[in-house]
Interface confidence: low
Amino acid sequence: HNTTVFQGVAGQSLQVSCPYDSMKHWGRRKAWCRQLGEKGPCQRVVSTHNLWLLSFLRRWNGSTAITDDTLGGTLTITLRNLQPHDAGLYQCQSLHGSEADTLRKVLVEVLADPLDHRDAGDLWFPGESESFEDAHVEHSISRSLLEGEIPFPPTS
Protein backbone atom coordinates (compact mmCIF):
# COMPACT_ATOMS: atom_id res chain seq x y z
CA HIS A 1 0.00 0.00 0.00
CA ASN A 2 1.17 3.50 -0.81
CA THR A 3 0.89 6.09 1.93
CA THR A 4 -1.37 9.10 1.52
CA VAL A 5 -0.36 12.21 3.43
CA PHE A 6 -3.09 14.45 4.86
CA GLN A 7 -2.01 17.80 6.25
CA GLY A 8 -4.13 19.68 8.75
CA VAL A 9 -3.77 22.79 10.86
CA ALA A 10 -3.45 22.56 14.64
CA GLY A 11 -6.70 23.46 16.36
CA GLN A 12 -8.80 22.87 13.27
CA SER A 13 -10.58 19.82 11.89
CA LEU A 14 -9.01 17.44 9.39
CA GLN A 15 -11.05 15.15 7.17
CA VAL A 16 -9.43 11.97 5.91
CA SER A 17 -11.12 10.07 3.10
CA CYS A 18 -10.54 6.43 2.26
CA PRO A 19 -12.10 5.26 -1.01
CA TYR A 20 -12.82 1.56 -1.51
CA ASP A 21 -14.63 -0.89 -3.75
CA SER A 22 -18.18 -0.88 -2.38
CA MET A 23 -18.99 -4.29 -3.86
CA LYS A 24 -15.85 -6.01 -2.60
CA HIS A 25 -16.38 -4.66 0.92
CA TRP A 26 -20.19 -5.03 0.95
CA GLY A 27 -21.48 -5.81 4.44
CA ARG A 28 -18.18 -5.09 6.15
CA ARG A 29 -17.73 -2.68 9.02
CA LYS A 30 -14.80 -0.26 8.86
CA ALA A 31 -12.28 1.02 11.36
CA TRP A 32 -9.62 3.70 11.83
CA CYS A 33 -6.48 2.67 13.70
CA ARG A 34 -3.16 4.21 14.64
CA GLN A 35 0.03 2.43 13.63
CA LEU A 36 2.35 1.91 16.58
CA GLY A 37 5.78 1.95 14.98
CA GLU A 38 6.58 0.98 11.42
CA LYS A 39 5.92 -2.74 11.98
CA GLY A 40 3.96 -2.62 15.22
CA PRO A 41 0.26 -3.28 15.77
CA CYS A 42 -2.45 -0.93 14.57
CA GLN A 43 -4.37 0.31 17.60
CA ARG A 44 -8.10 0.78 17.00
CA VAL A 45 -9.27 4.36 17.45
CA VAL A 46 -12.86 4.18 16.26
CA SER A 47 -15.04 1.87 14.17
CA THR A 48 -18.31 2.23 12.32
CA HIS A 49 -21.71 1.29 13.73
CA ASN A 50 -22.15 -2.28 14.92
CA LEU A 51 -25.03 -2.61 12.47
CA TRP A 52 -23.60 -2.30 8.97
CA LEU A 53 -26.82 -0.79 7.61
CA LEU A 54 -26.32 2.09 10.05
CA SER A 55 -22.71 2.73 9.02
CA PHE A 56 -23.72 6.17 7.72
CA LEU A 57 -24.28 7.29 11.31
CA ARG A 58 -21.28 9.20 12.62
CA ARG A 59 -19.58 7.56 15.57
CA TRP A 60 -17.19 9.43 17.85
CA ASN A 61 -14.35 8.36 20.08
CA GLY A 62 -13.06 11.48 21.79
CA SER A 63 -12.18 13.95 19.06
CA THR A 64 -12.23 11.38 16.23
CA ALA A 65 -15.34 10.56 14.20
CA ILE A 66 -16.00 7.96 11.52
CA THR A 67 -18.78 7.61 8.95
CA ASP A 68 -19.13 5.27 5.99
CA ASP A 69 -20.83 5.86 2.64
CA THR A 70 -21.31 2.18 1.84
CA LEU A 71 -22.94 2.81 -1.52
CA GLY A 72 -20.41 5.35 -2.75
CA GLY A 73 -17.50 3.45 -1.22
CA THR A 74 -15.94 6.22 0.85
CA LEU A 75 -14.95 6.00 4.49
CA THR A 76 -14.53 9.42 6.12
CA ILE A 77 -12.67 10.12 9.34
CA THR A 78 -12.78 13.51 11.03
CA LEU A 79 -10.10 14.54 13.50
CA ARG A 80 -11.51 17.48 15.45
CA ASN A 81 -9.28 20.05 17.18
CA LEU A 82 -6.17 18.58 15.58
CA GLN A 83 -3.13 18.58 17.86
CA PRO A 84 0.60 17.98 17.18
CA HIS A 85 0.42 14.65 18.99
CA ASP A 86 -2.14 13.49 16.41
CA ALA A 87 0.61 13.39 13.78
CA GLY A 88 1.53 9.89 12.77
CA LEU A 89 0.71 6.81 10.76
CA TYR A 90 -2.85 5.48 10.56
CA GLN A 91 -4.85 2.96 8.58
CA CYS A 92 -8.37 2.75 7.24
CA GLN A 93 -9.49 -0.84 7.63
CA SER A 94 -12.27 -3.10 6.39
CA LEU A 95 -13.26 -5.67 9.00
CA HIS A 96 -14.33 -9.27 8.42
CA GLY A 97 -14.45 -11.55 11.41
CA SER A 98 -11.26 -11.11 13.38
CA GLU A 99 -9.36 -10.05 10.25
CA ALA A 100 -8.83 -6.54 8.90
CA ASP A 101 -7.94 -5.49 5.36
CA THR A 102 -6.06 -2.23 4.88
CA LEU A 103 -7.98 0.19 2.66
CA ARG A 104 -5.47 3.02 2.87
CA LYS A 105 -2.35 3.91 4.82
CA VAL A 106 -2.43 7.50 6.01
CA LEU A 107 0.25 9.80 7.37
CA VAL A 108 -1.28 12.71 9.27
CA GLU A 109 0.89 15.83 9.36
CA VAL A 110 0.01 18.69 11.71
CA LEU A 111 0.90 22.22 10.62
CA ALA A 112 1.01 25.17 12.98
CA ASP A 113 -1.85 27.65 12.70
CA PRO A 114 -1.30 29.73 9.54
CA LEU A 115 -2.85 32.71 11.33
CA ASP A 116 0.53 32.96 13.02
CA HIS A 117 1.81 35.47 10.46
CA ARG A 118 5.35 35.90 11.73
CA ASP A 119 7.80 36.11 8.87
CA ALA A 120 9.42 32.80 7.99
CA GLY A 121 12.83 34.45 7.81
CA ASP A 122 15.47 34.64 5.12
CA LEU A 123 15.94 30.87 4.98
CA TRP A 124 12.65 30.19 3.25
CA PHE A 125 11.32 31.28 -0.08
CA PRO A 126 8.10 30.23 -1.81
CA GLY A 127 8.27 27.37 -4.24
CA GLU A 128 6.25 24.62 -5.80
CA SER A 129 6.15 21.10 -4.43
CA GLU A 130 7.52 18.51 -6.80
CA SER A 131 7.32 14.76 -7.27
CA PHE A 132 8.22 11.79 -5.08
CA GLU A 133 7.69 8.08 -5.43
CA ASP A 134 5.93 6.78 -2.38
CA ALA A 135 2.82 8.71 -1.43
CA HIS A 136 0.81 11.83 -2.14
CA VAL A 137 -0.38 14.76 -0.10
CA GLU A 138 -3.88 15.98 0.42
CA HIS A 139 -3.94 19.41 2.03
CA SER A 140 -6.60 20.55 4.44
CA ILE A 141 -5.23 23.89 5.46
CA SER A 142 -8.10 26.35 5.57
CA ARG A 143 -10.92 26.81 8.03
CA SER A 144 -13.36 25.63 5.38
CA LEU A 145 -11.31 22.44 4.92
CA LEU A 146 -10.40 23.36 1.36
CA GLU A 147 -8.63 20.34 -0.12
CA GLY A 148 -6.14 20.57 -2.94
CA GLU A 149 -3.76 17.87 -4.04
CA ILE A 150 -0.04 18.48 -4.28
CA PRO A 151 1.95 15.97 -6.36
CA PHE A 152 4.20 15.26 -3.40
CA PRO A 153 4.51 12.07 -3.96
CA PRO A 154 2.20 10.69 -6.59
CA THR A 155 0.75 7.26 -6.01
CA SER A 156 1.85 4.69 -8.50
Epitope: Q7, A10, P84, H85, A87, G88, L89, L107, E109, V110, L111, A112, P114, D116, H117, R118, D119, A120, G121, L123, W124, F125, P126, G127, E128, S129, H139, I141, S142, I150
Partner: nanobody, 112 residues
Amino acid sequence: ESGGGLVQPGGSLRLSCAASGFAFSNYVMHWYRQAPEKERELVALIGSQGGAYTNYAGSVKGRFTISRDNTKNMVYLQMNNLKPEDTAVYYCNVVYNGRPNWGQGTQVTVSS
Protein backbone atom coordinates in the same frame (compact mmCIF):
# COMPACT_ATOMS: atom_id res chain seq x y z
CA GLU B 1 21.38 24.01 4.43
CA SER B 2 24.96 22.98 5.04
CA GLY B 3 27.09 19.84 5.12
CA GLY B 4 27.26 19.06 1.43
CA GLY B 5 30.45 18.36 -0.46
CA LEU B 6 32.39 15.85 -2.50
CA VAL B 7 32.51 12.31 -1.15
CA GLN B 8 33.61 8.95 -2.51
CA PRO B 9 31.10 6.13 -3.11
CA GLY B 10 30.39 4.35 0.15
CA GLY B 11 31.13 7.48 2.14
CA SER B 12 28.92 9.49 4.49
CA LEU B 13 27.72 13.06 4.89
CA ARG B 14 25.47 14.81 7.35
CA LEU B 15 23.34 17.65 6.07
CA SER B 16 21.96 20.30 8.41
CA CYS B 17 19.15 22.77 7.98
CA ALA B 18 18.63 25.71 10.33
CA ALA B 19 15.14 27.20 10.44
CA SER B 20 13.87 30.39 12.03
CA GLY B 21 10.86 32.64 12.22
CA PHE B 22 8.14 30.07 12.91
CA ALA B 23 7.10 27.55 15.54
CA PHE B 24 9.54 24.93 14.26
CA SER B 25 8.42 22.06 16.49
CA ASN B 26 4.87 22.21 15.10
CA TYR B 27 5.92 21.64 11.50
CA VAL B 28 6.64 18.55 9.50
CA MET B 29 10.04 18.92 7.80
CA HIS B 30 11.16 17.44 4.50
CA TRP B 31 14.38 16.85 2.60
CA TYR B 32 14.21 16.96 -1.19
CA ARG B 33 16.91 16.60 -3.80
CA GLN B 34 17.28 17.61 -7.42
CA ALA B 35 19.80 16.05 -9.77
CA PRO B 36 20.78 17.73 -13.06
CA GLU B 37 18.07 17.41 -15.71
CA LYS B 38 15.75 15.67 -13.22
CA GLU B 39 12.68 16.66 -11.23
CA ARG B 40 13.01 17.52 -7.58
CA GLU B 41 12.16 14.46 -5.51
CA LEU B 42 11.24 13.96 -1.88
CA VAL B 43 13.91 12.03 0.00
CA ALA B 44 12.62 11.98 3.57
CA LEU B 45 10.14 13.58 5.93
CA ILE B 46 9.91 13.79 9.70
CA GLY B 47 6.86 14.47 11.83
CA SER B 48 6.37 17.38 14.16
CA GLN B 49 7.18 17.47 17.87
CA GLY B 50 9.41 14.54 18.80
CA GLY B 51 9.85 13.52 15.19
CA ALA B 52 8.89 9.92 15.89
CA TYR B 53 7.33 9.56 12.43
CA THR B 54 9.63 9.32 9.46
CA ASN B 55 9.19 8.26 5.85
CA TYR B 56 11.78 7.69 3.15
CA ALA B 57 12.00 7.29 -0.60
CA GLY B 58 12.63 3.66 -1.47
CA SER B 59 15.95 4.52 -3.10
CA VAL B 60 17.43 5.81 0.19
CA LYS B 61 15.66 3.64 2.76
CA GLY B 62 18.18 1.99 5.06
CA ARG B 63 20.95 4.39 4.05
CA PHE B 64 19.57 7.82 4.99
CA THR B 65 18.25 8.91 8.36
CA ILE B 66 16.29 12.10 9.00
CA SER B 67 16.24 13.63 12.48
CA ARG B 68 15.44 16.91 14.15
CA ASP B 69 16.42 18.92 17.22
CA ASN B 70 13.50 21.13 18.21
CA THR B 71 15.60 22.91 20.83
CA LYS B 72 17.93 24.17 18.10
CA ASN B 73 15.39 24.49 15.27
CA MET B 74 17.49 22.10 13.22
CA VAL B 75 16.70 19.21 10.90
CA TYR B 76 19.37 16.77 9.75
CA LEU B 77 19.88 14.20 7.05
CA GLN B 78 22.49 11.55 7.79
CA MET B 79 23.52 9.93 4.51
CA ASN B 80 25.52 6.69 4.63
CA ASN B 81 26.77 4.33 1.92
CA LEU B 82 26.43 7.09 -0.65
CA LYS B 83 26.15 6.19 -4.32
CA PRO B 84 26.90 8.21 -7.46
CA GLU B 85 23.17 8.42 -8.13
CA ASP B 86 22.78 10.36 -4.86
CA THR B 87 24.57 13.28 -6.50
CA ALA B 88 22.18 16.24 -6.38
CA VAL B 89 21.39 19.55 -4.73
CA TYR B 90 19.63 18.81 -1.42
CA TYR B 91 16.96 21.14 -0.07
CA CYS B 92 15.08 21.24 3.19
CA ASN B 93 11.42 22.16 2.95
CA VAL B 94 8.57 23.18 5.20
CA VAL B 95 4.94 23.89 4.40
CA TYR B 96 4.47 27.30 6.01
CA ASN B 97 1.28 29.37 5.87
CA GLY B 98 -0.18 26.80 3.53
CA ARG B 99 2.58 26.82 0.92
CA PRO B 100 5.84 24.93 0.39
CA ASN B 101 8.98 26.91 1.24
CA TRP B 102 12.50 25.96 0.32
CA GLY B 103 16.00 26.49 1.62
CA GLN B 104 18.79 27.56 -0.71
CA GLY B 105 20.16 24.03 -1.20
CA THR B 106 23.49 22.30 -0.67
CA GLN B 107 25.40 20.37 -3.33
CA VAL B 108 26.26 16.71 -2.71
CA THR B 109 28.59 15.06 -5.21
CA VAL B 110 29.40 11.36 -4.98
CA SER B 111 32.33 10.48 -7.20
CA SER B 112 35.57 8.56 -7.10
